[in-house]
């Protein structure tokens, strides 16, 4: 088939697992704190179903005393992950999701990793170093993205429909050619958002609507031939 | 998959009137509409008009309105193309298109000749 | 109706180059398009679909983009077989409109 001329028209992104991360290799690591202490937080948007990788600030390990990951979720308590150095031991409190653990060994590398991201993910994420020097922190507000699917269809007489599912964030719909239109945005419980965008063509040289859908995640476009009004034999252009 | 099958050639004298067919298979006949775009040789492509099969509704650009009809068998699924007092402006290859201009029959060469 | 201006109407390119053309509405009408490309004899085929999307099977080497109300149809890597004419097609409005092409020949 076409890509993009059937009647009813269905769009899902498909993902492979891939992965993100805003750490610093260790050529960037530096003594001069100071940069690290500007960049305390950051506002990170990651697709869902790929995985992450979570830095702590860019501190030689040799000058450190813990290591905590503090996780805040939503609806949930407050998860620690720490790592003391001086006796090589772990402890974690209140954290039961199994896809956010350690990279590798804390002794090793400090950075967490979230395997396949879910909507649940969605929170604030802390790296706490203790040092000699002081307490270095960097926190990311994990902004989870979820790819919405898109349909658009002719309901009525010269009237179409298109529809970005269960999008987070919201997707917002236009139109070429602009028509007649209403949007309606539908919240759900997991923190998703459906938007409906119906228009309708009364100018009668309009032949084909495309509904253009942008998203973080990516844009797509659909488009449909408008089908003739009912009744309607014979119309000259 | 979808195919839409045309004569290669016709040729008709000048003031004569030719019927084009152009048969679909592999989808929905009745959902979709056919164009039909006529090409003069080197020169470029211009729409004829379209016929929704499910309706018989059609539209024709003001260019044509007086040299072609369009018509539907549903029972064949073929849609057909009537140009009627041919002269030598008429001469060019006739494709039928379909599914929003992704799908193109081969084209119907049309010479008119005395 | 809506014209649309394709440019260059030909071009010459050599093997490996990156070839480009453009197809504008008239008026700065809001469109969507279809590029397709047609070789002697032949019906046109659609390369690239609602401006942008690659059509299945079609060489990666080609892609379409859009700013504003212009659209661009690029080779990145010029080959032998891409030898054509290429046009672009308004499908938002009737009478739909043909671009007057763009004939590539390969220096």
């Known amino acids: 088939q076409p890509n993009n001329s059937l009647m009813l028209q269905t769009s899902k992104e498909n993902h492979a697992l891939a992965s993100s991360s805003l750490c610093m290799d260790e050529k960037q690591i530096t003594q001069n704190y100071s940069k690290v202490l500007a960049e305390v937080n950051t506002s990170w948007p990651v697709k869902m179903a790929t995985n992450a990788v979570l830095c702590c600030p860019p501190i030689a390990l040799r000058n450190l005393i813990i290591i905590t990951w503090e996780i805040i979720l939503r609806g949930q308590p407050s998860c620690t992950k720490a790592y003391k150095k001086e006796t090589n031991e772990t402890k974690e409190t209140n954290c039961t999701d199994e896809r956010i653990t350690w990279v590798s060994r804390p002794d090793q590398n400090s950075d967490l990793q979230i395997r396949t991201v879910a909507i649940t993910h969605d929170g604030y994420y802390r790296c706490i170093m203790v040092t000699p020097d002081g307490n270095f922190h960097r926190g990311y507000h994990l902004q989870v993205l979820v790819t919405p699917e898109v349909t658009l269809f002719q309901n009525r007489n010269r009237t179409a429909v298109c529809k970005a599912v269960a999008g987070k964030p919201a997707a917002h719909i236009s139109w070429i050619p602009e028509g007649d239109c209403a949007t309606k945005q539908e919240y759900w419980s997991n923190g998703t958002v459906t938007v409906k965008s119906t228009c309708h063509w009364e100018v009668h040289n309009v032949s084909t609507v495309t509904c253009h859908v942008s998203h973080l995640t990516g844009n797509k476009s659909l488009y449909i031939e408008l089908l003739p009004v009912p009744g309607a034999k014979k119309s000259a252009k | 998959q979808v195919q839409l099958q045309q004569p290669g050639s016709e040729l008709v004298r000048p003031g004569a009137s030719v019927k084009l067919s152009c048969k679909a298979s592999?989808?929905?006949?009745?959902?979709?509409?056919m164009h039909w775009v006529k090409q003069r040789p080197g020169q470029g492509l211009e729409w004829i008009g379209n016929?929704?099969?499910?309706?018989?509704?059609?539209n024709y650009d003001e260019k044509f309105k007086s040299k072609a009809i369009m018509t539907v068998d549903i029972s064949s699924s073929t849609v057909y193309m009537h140009l009627s007092s041919l002269t030598s402006e008429d001469s060019a290859v006739y494709y039928c298109?379909?599914?929003?201009?992704?799908?193109w029959g081969q084209g119907t060469l049309v010479t008119v000749s005395a | 109706d809506v014209q649309m201006i394709q440019s260059p109407s030909s071009l010459s390119a050599s093997m490996g180059d990156i070839v480009t053309m453009t197809c504008q509405a008239s008026q700065g009408t809001n469109i969507n398009l279809h590029w397709f490309q047609q070789k002697p004899g032949k019906a046109p085929k659609l390369l690239i679909s609602g401006g942008s999307n690659l059509e299945d099977g079609v060489p990666s080497r080609f892609s379409g983009s859009r700013y504003g109300t212009d659209f661009t149809l690029t080779i990145s890597s010029l080959e032998d077989e891409d030898m054509a004419t290429y046009f672009c097609?308004?499908?938002?409005?009737?009478?739909?409109?043909f671009g007057g092409g763009t004939k590539l020949d390969i220096k």
């Open positions: 592999g989808y929905t006949f009745t959902s979709y509409w």
């Open positions: 016929i929704f099969p499910g309706s018989d509704t059609t």
């Open positions: 298109i379909t599914y929003t201009g992704a799908y």
């Open positions: 097609l308004q499908f938002t409005y009737l009478p739909w409109t």
